[in-house]
């Protein structure tokens, strides 16, 4: 059967018949954006819509993490009729919309990347004029933030029998592989730990017994470059203590 | 964890009403999304009744139109399927289901069985 | 309304073996957004429908990968590599490209 009727919201003549499109959204993002730690990086989202010519308030959201639940990092809200998304959150200040949701465009802007930036995001845009309808994301754009090796902690530590052990750990992307040098060594990849759980940049190398004085090195290295760092092991002979 | 869960009377005399309620727990009904029932007649035949979206406007079966209305009440978290005038052929299993802006029902409630019978 | 055709009715397997069930629309099902809203679930004795396959190809979050979905305009195939003894139970496809959304009749899997 066909039906004609008035739709009061647009006061347009609509047909409906038996079988009709489903209103439905669409976005549009990749599925990776890759950038360098200190640099910026823009994620791409657009969107159609099934509402014609929406013109009432809108807000546009990024969530990090998860959809629908996930953090926030930056929402914005434009008035009626306005092309002016004013920002309400901008986490640490890093985020700027670049796209015009009006013109259907939530392309998001991120400062000064950090590794911890490398996570899935999730744009999102709510109409909340006369219509009333939303939309998210359900796959998201993943941030993959590249680094070069950076070492961030390098340590010497008591060992059961006043032996010794020492300790690197650095981070970087893709993860460095970490390598130990120093007193009748050569070089070394000793012990290297898998990156611990919820720190997927961090490795960590252990030497487990350190035999002689003198100076250790670590060096840590990926394709983007190396970074290295050392101790010094001085015991105390006749005495338990050690300095390094 | 989002938990979706039917009620309803079980037993109904044809030509009367049917009222089933299902409860959500762990997600807003108003937040998001549509909130859909199903119903699956015995022979496994499952058929799309209808949905309420968290805005509140509603989109039914054509053809179940004239004798199906889904409600809500937002202060308990509930969404509500009456169908008016049945007949056995409404005896059948009715999900409440959420469907997520991509077309998908991620989240069903467990079922309940409801018989048309004099 | 869209009907949505599966077969076979009944698809005997032995656990290991590969397994495909085709889904046919009675009209196309790409939405005027560009997308294809055809879902798979997966409705296991005594249970509700679980979904597997949503917008022809996405696996849903927690299945395995040993479930995978084709097809565009009206016809769509769901293949499973490897049955395993906890996908034994009834497989629907379903659009919501189309007010009223339609599911397919079942196609159940069985073992031998």
């Known amino acids: 059967f066909v039906r004609t009727k008035i739709d009061t919201t647009e006061n347009l003549l609509n047909t409906e018949v038996h079988s009709s499109p489903a209103q439905r959204w669409s976005m549009q993002v990749p599925p990776e954006v890759s950038a360098e730690a200190g640099d910026a990086a823009v994620l791409p989202c657009t969107f159609t819509h099934p509402h014609r010519h929406y013109d009432g308030p809108l807000t546009a959201i990024w969530r990090a993490g998860e959809p629908y639940a996930g953090p926030q990092v930056f929402r914005c809200a434009a008035a009626r009729g306005s092309e002016l998304c004013q920002t309400a959150l901008s986490l640490h200040g890093r985020f700027r919309l670049l796209g015009n949701p009006r013109r259907n465009d939530l392309s998001l802007r991120v400062e000064r990347l950090a590794l911890a930036d490398d996570r899935r995001y999730f744009c999102r845009v709510e109409f909340a004029g006369d219509v009333h309808d939303r939309y998210e994301s359900r796959h998201g754009v993943r941030l993959h933030v590249t680094a070069a090796p950076r070492i961030v902690n390098i340590s010497v530590l008591p060992s059961p029998a006043h032996a010794f052990r020492a300790l690197c750990t650095a981070e970087g992307e893709p993860p460095p592989a970490l390598a130990w040098s120093g007193p009748a060594l050569g070089n070394s990849l000793a012990a290297v730990r898998s990156p611990r759980e919820g720190h997927g940049h961090l490795v960590t190398a252990e030497l487990p017994a350190l035999t002689h004085d003198g100076r250790y090195t670590c060096t840590a290295a990926n394709s983007l470059g190396r970074s290295e760092a050392s101790v010094y092991l001085f015991r105390f002979h006749g005495a338990s203590g050690a300095s390094t | 964890d989002v938990q979706l869960q039917e009620s309803g009377p079980g037993l109904v005399k044809p030509s009367q009403s049917l009222s089933l309620t299902c409860t959500v727990t762990g997600y807003s009904i108003t937040s998001d999304f549509a909130w859909n029932w199903i119903r699956q007649f015995p022979g496994n035949k499952l058929e799309w009744m209808g949905y309420i979206r968290f805005s509140g406007s509603t989109t039914y079966k054509p053809t179940l139109k004239s004798r199906i209305s889904i409600t809500r009440d937002t202060s308990k978290n509930q969404f509500f399927l009456q169908l008016n005038s049945v007949t056995t052929e409404d005896s059948a299993t009715y999900y409440c289901?959420?469907?997520?802006?991509?077309?998908?029902?991620?989240?069903w409630g467990q079922g309940t069985t409801l018989t048309v019978t004099s | 309304d869209v009907l949505m055709t599966q077969t076979p009715l009944s698809l005997p397997v032995s656990l290991g073996d590969h397994a495909s069930i085709s889904c046919r629309s009675s009209?196309?099902?790409?939405?005027?957004?560009?997308?294809?809203?055809l879902d798979w679930y997966l409705q296991k004795p005594g249970q509700s429908p679980k979904l597997l396959i949503y917008?022809?190809?996405n696996r849903f979050s927690g299945v395995p990968d040993r479930f995978s979905g084709s097809g565009s305009g009206t016809d769509f195939t769901l293949k499973i590599s490897r049955v395993e003894a906890e996908d034994l139970g009834v497989y629907y496809c379903f659009q919501g490209s189309h007010v009223p959304y339609t599911f397919g009749g079942g196609t159940k899997l069985e073992i031998k």
């Open positions: 289901a959420r469907e997520d802006y991509d077309g998908l029902f991620d989240y």
């Open positions: 009209q196309t099902i790409l939405h005027s957004n560009g997308n294809t809203y």
């Open positions: 917008k022809v190809s």
